[in-house]
């Protein structure tokens, strides 16, 4: 049996969209089917349709096709949003350029190259001819539009309305001339859908004839629409998988735009003074990492050999030794001039103001009444009245319903970190909104920082796990692996949740990460019996500026003699000065023959004011930070320890009171370390654990 060609590649898809006909004279045909591919095949062949099919809608809920003799550009028609509908428009009818000789051109240009109006195909005046629409079915000889029914050399043409000029070609550009890209086309979002050798591109949402990993839903920011050429992976120029089973992929012929025609929509916003988003567009001249170590030049191979070279990343402005983010990391970084520290983040570069216009909140935003209705990650907020059951589940009072109107960002649960909303996305049930505290607002969200008011420990009993006091057990320590190598520490705070730092995730692909639990040696040597290796299923970023991440494991860890959880402190608690604490990590130890064993450094808590003095007044600590100094000069956290815990004991109970993050020095003598204060974020952690679904063991 001859395999029917898959024609869905000839259609432009608009998700969640349908067409409504305002003109009742317009025809429409419907039928129950299983897939959009079936609708496409019938539309292309016009089989059993009383009109020329230009578009169709696939109703996913009813499994039904609606075929149209019109498209979204036709008069008497309007577009409408609808969750269950996907609109597919035949590209030939909406394209305003030609491919090759333009045999498939079905656009509406009706004027010749020299400006003469075309003669209608069905007319014999002023020129008699044999190109009748009935003789050339499927060639769309409609109205007086330019066409090339025989695929002749000059491209689309028409008979002219001038009796002196029988026919003339029309001036319709080649799609390869119209389409252009900047740089290497990573941000190209044009409509080129065939390769430089003329092969039709495979749809990104299809896995035939070529299976691939570039799924549109997995990479929503890569512009994987229909079967258009794209450059998601840093190629020299856009490409696509092809419909030829023997040619997996090929480049597309897209020329570089002249400077004045740059119309790429997705170029990261270029900034020089601050970081927007992940700083991929940062083009400033900061050239040291967070602790002042100068950066290595990108075009240098000393002291660190690397292949992040300017010619490998032509569009990333790898000039001099400036901090940049060429690889989609969390923020700008560079190789360092210190032979012992390969890379470092430039986390001292401030974030550009993310707030929307003049929108801001005071205190913790519980009285915010603005009308922003989008989360910081761009998700649209869902209506409060649809989520009241969930809200009641994590607050113990009746929320003020008068404030919870529409889907606006609000703070009904007194969240310390500002207004938020539910999203309707099951993976991200809720998130904060991109609103800043009003300038000059100094209302503290926790009071009396340096005076022990609330005890950090939840209980005064000594906890024992399987007969071993927890003080000798470091089973909550996690080694976060990036592409099979230790990159950061973390703390197991619940069977499915690890608390770590946001700087630990250089790539967005979760398949790059694993969590190793129950190990003492960073390579897992000798830990085979006790080691648990778990995949990562989600990253939940902490409140703005927190540098925290809650990492959800793909399955819960099994708690045993070697793997245990560590307690969180009470929200807003303070631990007395001089309390003895410890930091743990497998990071760089300063030793050439580093043995890979888990290290511990003993520190003691220092009040924020005294800590600031030790930093020569250059650092002002806020309520979200905690300070601890080394008992021994030069011992403390370092790169590779990031994400790991500052563990303190109170009433014989061990808790994670701090998280190690880049930014405040790598065991610098007489300089205490500054950590993210977990007590300040404890409510956020509990709220995530309570509201995010986790896999059952």
């Amino acid at each position: 049996q001859r395999k029917r060609r898959n024609t869905i590649h000839e259609f432009k898809k608009s998700a969640k969209t349908t067409l409504i006909k305002i003109d009742p004279a317009l025809k429409i045909k419907t039928k129950k089917v299983n897939t959009a591919d079936q609708c496409a095949n019938r539309c292309t062949r016009n089989k059993g349709l009383p009109f020329t099919c230009k578009a169709f809608v696939f109703d996913k809920a009813r499994k039904q096709c609606l075929w149209f003799p019109f498209n979204s550009m036709s008069s008497g028609v309007k577009k409408e949003f609808g969750h269950e509908f996907d609109l597919y428009e035949n590209k030939d009818y909406i394209r305003n350029c030609i491919i090759g000789k333009g045999r498939s051109y079905k656009g509406t240009v009706s004027i010749t190259k020299s400006g003469i109006k075309c003669q209608p195909w069905s007319s014999m005046i002023p020129h008699e001819h044999s190109f009748l629409p009935s003789s050339y079915r499927g060639k769309d000889l409609q109205e007086n539009y330019c066409r090339n029914p025989r695929g002749e050399e000059g491209g689309p043409w028409c008979f002219t309305s001038n009796p002196e000029v029988r026919y003339e070609v029309c001036d319709i550009p080649q799609c390869s001339e119209v389409e252009c890209m900047t740089c290497n086309g990573e941000s190209y979002r044009g409509l080129m859908d065939h390769t430089e050798s003329g092969k039709i591109c495979q749809r990104w949402d299809h896995q035939t004839p070529h299976r691939h990993k570039f799924l549109p839903e997995r990479y929503p920011d890569k512009g994987f629409d229909d079967n258009y050429c794209r450059n998601p992976d840093g190629q020299p120029r856009p490409w696509c998988y092809t419909l030829d089973p023997h040619t997996r992929w090929e480049y597309c012929a897209i020329k570089t735009c002249a400077d004045n025609t740059m119309n790429d929509t997705d170029v990261p916003l270029e900034t020089t003074e601050c970081i927007q988003g992940q700083g991929e567009g940062y083009r400033g001249t900061v050239n040291t990492i967070w602790n002042g170590i100068p950066c290595q030049r990108w075009d240098s191979q000393y002291p660190h050999e690397h292949d992040m070279t300017p010619e490998n990343f032509k569009c990333k402005d790898l000039r001099e030794n400036y901090c940049r983010n060429p690889d989609g990391s969390e923020s700008p970084w560079c190789f360092t001039t210190d032979p012992n520290i390969r890379v470092g983040y430039c986390s001292q570069i401030p974030n550009c103001d993310m707030s929307h216009g003049q929108d801001c909140y005071r205190g913790n935003g519980k009285n915010y009444m603005g009308n922003l209705s989008q989360t910081r990650s761009g998700l649209t907020c869902s209506m409060w009245d649809k989520n009241m059951e969930d809200l009641h589940r994590h607050i113990f009072w009746e929320p003020d319903a008068s404030k919870l109107n529409e889907n606006y960002c609000r703070n009904p649960d007194d969240d310390a970190h500002g207004p938020w909303c539910y999203t309707g996305n099951p993976l991200i049930p809720w998130d904060y909104c991109p609103i800043s505290r009003c300038e000059g607002d100094t209302t503290p969200t926790i009071v009396n920082l340096d005076h022990p008011v609330i005890s950090c420990a939840k209980t005064k009993q000594l906890r024992v796990v399987n007969g071993i006091p927890t003080r000798t057990n470091i089973g909550w320590m996690v080694s976060l692996r990036y592409r099979n190598k230790h990159i950061c520490g973390g703390s197991l705070i619940k069977e499915s949740w690890v608390l770590t730092a946001r700087q630990c995730f250089p790539s967005r692909d979760l398949k790059d990460y694993e969590a190793w639990l129950g190990i003492h040696d960073v390579h897992g040597r000798g830990d085979e019996k006790c080691k648990q290796v778990l995949n990562v299923s989600q990253l939940v970023y902490g409140p703005e500026g927190s540098d925290l991440v809650l990492m959800k494991l793909a399955r819960p860890a099994v708690l045993d003699d070697f793997v245990s959880t560590i307690d969180l402190p009470n929200y807003g608690c303070t631990i007395p000065e001089k309390t003895s604490c410890s930091v743990y990590g497998w990071g760089y130890t300063g030793l050439i023959n580093y043995d890979g064993l888990l290290r511990v450094a003993h520190l003691y808590i220092m009040g924020n004011e005294k800590c600031s003095q030790h930093h020569r007044g250059k650092v002002t600590l806020n309520e979200s930070e905690i300070c601890a100094g080394a008992e021994k000069i030069g011992s403390g956290p370092c790169e590779g320890d990031y994400g790991g815990p500052l563990v303190c004991e109170q009433h014989k109970m061990r808790m994670v009171l701090g998280v190690i993050v880049p930014g405040r020095g790598c065991a610098i003598p007489n300089r205490p370390g500054i950590f993210v204060r977990v007590a300040y974020y404890a409510k956020w952690i509990h709220k995530i654990i309570l509201t995010y679904k986790v896999p059952q063991s």
Partner: nanobody, 126 residues
């Protein structure tokens, strides 16, 4: 997925030359860094040479510097290792490897490479 197939190995006398080829097909990432490694009998696999796909930077092991040259034909998706003045200690299985650019490891490190060929035997007799 990227597949790498080496060819061009064989038996050669000391002082002679060989040219190894590596055919690169399929792909998941680009621009690549391409490397050659070798494993002599009873020894660990060791770095020989590497270069960025565009050829802007190349790296060589001290033991082969001045004798071996890594090159590529981008149009044909081929990477070559031209080996001159061969010595008996160059006897090994030679592997072609591919990596996407990254900051974590030096291009000399075996663990940096995600894709490997099956290897081709080079024997240098004295």
């Amino acid at each position: 997925e990227v597949q790498l197939v080496e060819s061009g190995g064989g038996l050669v006398q000391a002082g002679g030359s060989l040219r190894l080829s590596c055919a690169v097909s399929g792909r998941t990432f680009s621009p690549y860094t391409m490397g050659w490694f070798r494993r002599a009998p009873g020894k660990e696999r060791e770095f020989v040479a590497a270069r960025t796909w565009s050829g802007g930077v190349a790296w060589y092991a001290d033991s082969v510097k001045g004798r071996f040259t890594i090159s590529s034909d981008n149009a044909e998706n081929m990477v070559y290792l031209q080996m001159n003045s061969l010595k008996p200690e160059d006897t090994a299985v030679y592997y072609c490897a591919a990596k996407s650019p990254g900051r974590t490891y030096s291009p000399r490190e075996e663990r940096a490479y995600a894709r490997w060929g099956q290897g081709t035997q080079v024997t240098v007799s004295s």
